[in-house]
């Protein structure tokens, strides 16, 4: 065996283990004939704290008093320095600085499940920084005792490995933990308990749910529990919710009826158990059961709106639109919508099932009184039909809302305001605000949006399907019985100057004046609602300011006459467009020379 300290020794007094704040004496002494050759008086013993010199002495031994050592471990090393040679390592020693253990606090014991074993936890108090041994003792009836030790540096948990049984559930047991290290010992206060106090049941398992006759109103939750369980608590919530519904039940025997579940909703269920009304603790929550409740027939009614379009003298196109039911109203997966169209006087009726759409278009005669009914169907049944009489929504001029305005209200919102119609305002049953993207061709495929407003409201904030830099055609309808009046306006939530001007595609001469025709600016370049077009013209090769004509914007207009040009003079013409934010750049330039006679 190699002797690491063959040249000398390091001794520590009073001990290698000291209380924080204490002083230690460290002695380094050379063994016989281990000093510097020839010059033993020249022995220079040096004491290092780790690698930092703290003391030295000439001779065969060195004594050093050390104070102020920190908590934890410090390594001291003694070396010998001789003339003309490297320092020689003599020996080393560790000193451990710590404190006596504090009294362990909050000792508590638990047995997980009726077949589990007793385990206790406690709070150690402040770190001793020393090797500390913990002994846990349990004493029970008939002088029975059990003991377990733990030598882990951070010991605050021990399992006795014994199982308490329910034969005498009221028998008392007492636990105590004692901490011991080189500087002292301390014991916890005793903790006394019975079987019922410390047994924490295992969480329930094998959780199932049954819906009798596939109905949400006849729902039973089943589970399995340990034999002695008396109480259960159930918690459940829709999977998309953070709030739990809680139910406490006694002597449930592994089943409970739930009466307030919503149809067609995924729920999460958990159960916990307890052995006694006021003793012991609740088990952990069981693993979650996730289950979807069955469908029920839809409630509520569809919000239906429509549009009429004249085709010819005998036919009209009806486009029906409806909004999806809310999840709580649909109460299942909507399989189809049933649309019934009926001529009220002749009683002719046509029914159609629509899947995958929330709109329907058909052509009907312009004569007769027509009504539609729309309902939503899932696997369990249909909602109540929404019935609408088809009328000319804008026929009653006296019902037209007045002073309609549309103003941007923050990002992607438009505030629509109006005044009640001149005709008795109290006759209005409701207002409908309708909006759709403005397309110059009057495209009927453009999605329609609407909202309903109570008769006492004179404003509505529209935000659904509103995009920046897009112009919307907004209509406000006032409905009264089988009559309606409407007013319209253009509006946008955000605008800037158009990106381009109109493209002049033709200039024709008519009776001494000219007719300018242009192509509309593409919708994506309009950047909001157009207010005006400007037509500019000036003589070719002239440096004079151009003349201009400003035309109010109308959706369908794409030509305009100008009659102030001189004959046989060549002009250059171009156009711009304006929104409330400014004027576009020039469109294309066209030259034209009027051939007519001079006045």
């Amino acid at each position: 065996k190699i002797d690491a300290c063959k040249r000398g020794d390091v001794t520590v007094k009073p001990s290698h283990v000291i209380l924080l704040g204490s002083t230690v004496n460290i002695t380094c002494s050379l063994k016989p004939r281990q000093g510097c050759f020839h010059y033993s008086r020249r022995n220079k013993l040096i004491l290092y704290k780790f690698d930092r010199r703290i003391n030295f002495h000439h001779g065969h031994s060195l004594n050093s008093q050390v104070t102020g050592l920190p908590l934890g471990t410090t390594l001291f090393v003694c070396k010998l320095a001789c003339i003309n040679s490297d320092e020689i390592q003599i020996c080393g020693a560790e000193i451990f600085v710590g404190v006596a253990p504090e009294q362990p606090q909050n000792l508590s014991c638990i047995q997980k499940g009726e077949q589990g074993t007793v385990a206790c936890t406690w709070e150690r108090g402040r770190d001793t920084h020393l090797y500390t041994e913990y002994t846990l003792q349990l004493s029970g009836p008939k002088n029975l005792t059990w003991q377990k030790q733990c030598k882990d540096i951070y010991c605050d948990y021990l399992d006795f490995g014994i199982n308490l049984t329910p034969e005498s559930p009221e028998s008392n047991f007492t636990a105590k933990v004692t901490a011991v290290n080189s500087l002292g010992s301390s014991s916890s206060l005793p903790s006394t308990f019975t079987f019922l106090d410390i047994v924490r049941p295992l969480p329930p398992w094998d959780i199932r749910i049954k819906f009798q006759k596939a109905s949400v109103s006849r729902c039973t939750l089943y589970w399995r529990d340990e034999g002695l369980v008396l109480l259960n608590r159930l918690r459940y919530r829709p999977s998309n919710s953070r709030l739990w519904n809680m139910v406490n039940v006694t002597k449930a025997k592994g089943r409970h009826d739930l009466l307030d579940l919503k149809p067609f909703t995924e729920y999460e269920f958990q159960i916990s158990s307890k052995l006694h009304l006021y003793k012991g603790s609740w088990s952990d929550w069981s693993e979650s059961l996730r289950a979807q409740t069955p469908e029920e027939e839809p409630t509520g009614m569809l919000d239906v709106w429509y549009m009429k379009r004249h085709i010819d003298y005998s036919r009209q196109q009806i486009s029906l639109f409806w909004k999806n039911l809310s999840v709580s109203e649909a109460r299942g997966k909507i399989l189809h919508y049933q649309v019934t169209l009926q001529e009220l006087t002749g009683g002719k009726a046509m029914t159609q099932n629509i899947t995958g759409h929330t709109s329907w278009t058909t052509v009907i005669p312009r004569t007769g009184n027509w009504a539609v009914a729309v309902s939503a169907a899932n696997s369990k049944g249909s909602s109540l039909p929404t019935r609408i009489n088809i009328m000319n929504l804008c026929e009653a001029g006296l019902l037209a809302p007045r002073q309609v305005s549309a103003n941007s209200e923050g990002m992607d919102n438009i505030l629509v305001t109006w005044q009640p119609p001149r005709k008795d305002p109290s006759a209005v049953q409701e207002y409908v605000v309708e909006w759709r993207e403005l397309h110059p061709g009057g495209d009927t495929q453009v999605p329609l949006n609407w909202l309903r407003s109570r008769p006492y409201n004179v404003s509505a904030l529209i935000s659904e399907n509103i995009k920046s830099y897009i112009c919307y055609e907004i209509r406000v309808y006032a409905l009264s019985g089988d009559q309606g009046g409407c007013s319209s306006i253009l509006g946008n939530s955000k605008h800037k100057a158009p990106l381009s001007g109109p493209h002049i595609n033709a200039i024709t001469e008519e009776k001494g004046s000219i007719l300018i025709s242009w192509n509309s600016i593409p919708v994506q370049e309009q950047m909001g609602c157009l207010l005006h077009y400007r037509i500019y013209w000036k003589e070719r090769d002239s440096n004079s300011q151009p003349q201009l004509c400003e035309i109010p914007y109308r959706v369908s207009q794409n030509s305009h006459p100008i009659n102030s040009l001189q004959p046989r003079v060549t002009y250059v013409l171009w156009m711009t467009a304006l929104t409330a934010a400014g004027e576009s750049s020039h469109g294309n330039e066209r030259e034209f020379c009027l051939q007519g006679k001079a006045n």
Epitope: A4, D51, Q89, G92
Partner: nanobody
Framework: QVQLVESGGGLVQPGGSLRLSCAAS????????MSWFRQAPGKGPEWVSA??????????YYADSVKGRFTISRDNAKKTLYLQMKSLKPEDTAVYYC????????????????RGEGTQVTVSS
């Protein structure tokens, strides 16, 4: 008393492998960084590798001359430090010894508190 005893040295051919061990006793081992040094004949000590205090997942450091060939590890339960040496070269010939050290280990020689006597490694064909 603090003691570090190296073993595992010997004669090996170039390209061969050796595993050195350093058994610690008389001190707590776990709270200290540990290093391997080597000293070739007629030369001063050269730091080879170090491992942080604590578990086997402690950070490791290597001199450029041995990077990718040597691996340092420790087993705190056995109070033992290891150096696995592969692809050995004649210039690796030296006395290898372990030491209780403190960093840094990047650009300067680490601080040494205590070292073992060493074990001879000879790489020769």
């Amino acid at each position: 008393q603090v003691q570090l005893v190296e073993s595992g040295g010997g004669l090996v051919q170039p390209g061969g492998s050796l595993r050195l061990s350093c058994a610690a006793s008389g001190f707590t081992f776990e709270p200290y960084d540990m290093s391997w040094f080597r000293q070739a004949p007629g030369k001063g000590p050269e730091w080879v590798s170090a491992i942080d205090k604590g578990g086997g997942a402690g950070a490791t450091y290597y001199a450029d001359s041995v990077k990718g060939r040597f691996t340092i590890s420790r087993d705190n339960a056995k109070k033992t430090l290891y150096l696995q040496m592969k692809s050995l070269k004649p210039e690796d010939t030296a006395v290898y010894y372990c030491a209780i050290t403190a960093g840094p280990y990047s650009d300067s020689t680490p601080r040494v508190a205590y070292r073992g006597e060493g074990t001879q490694v000879t790489v020769s064909s």
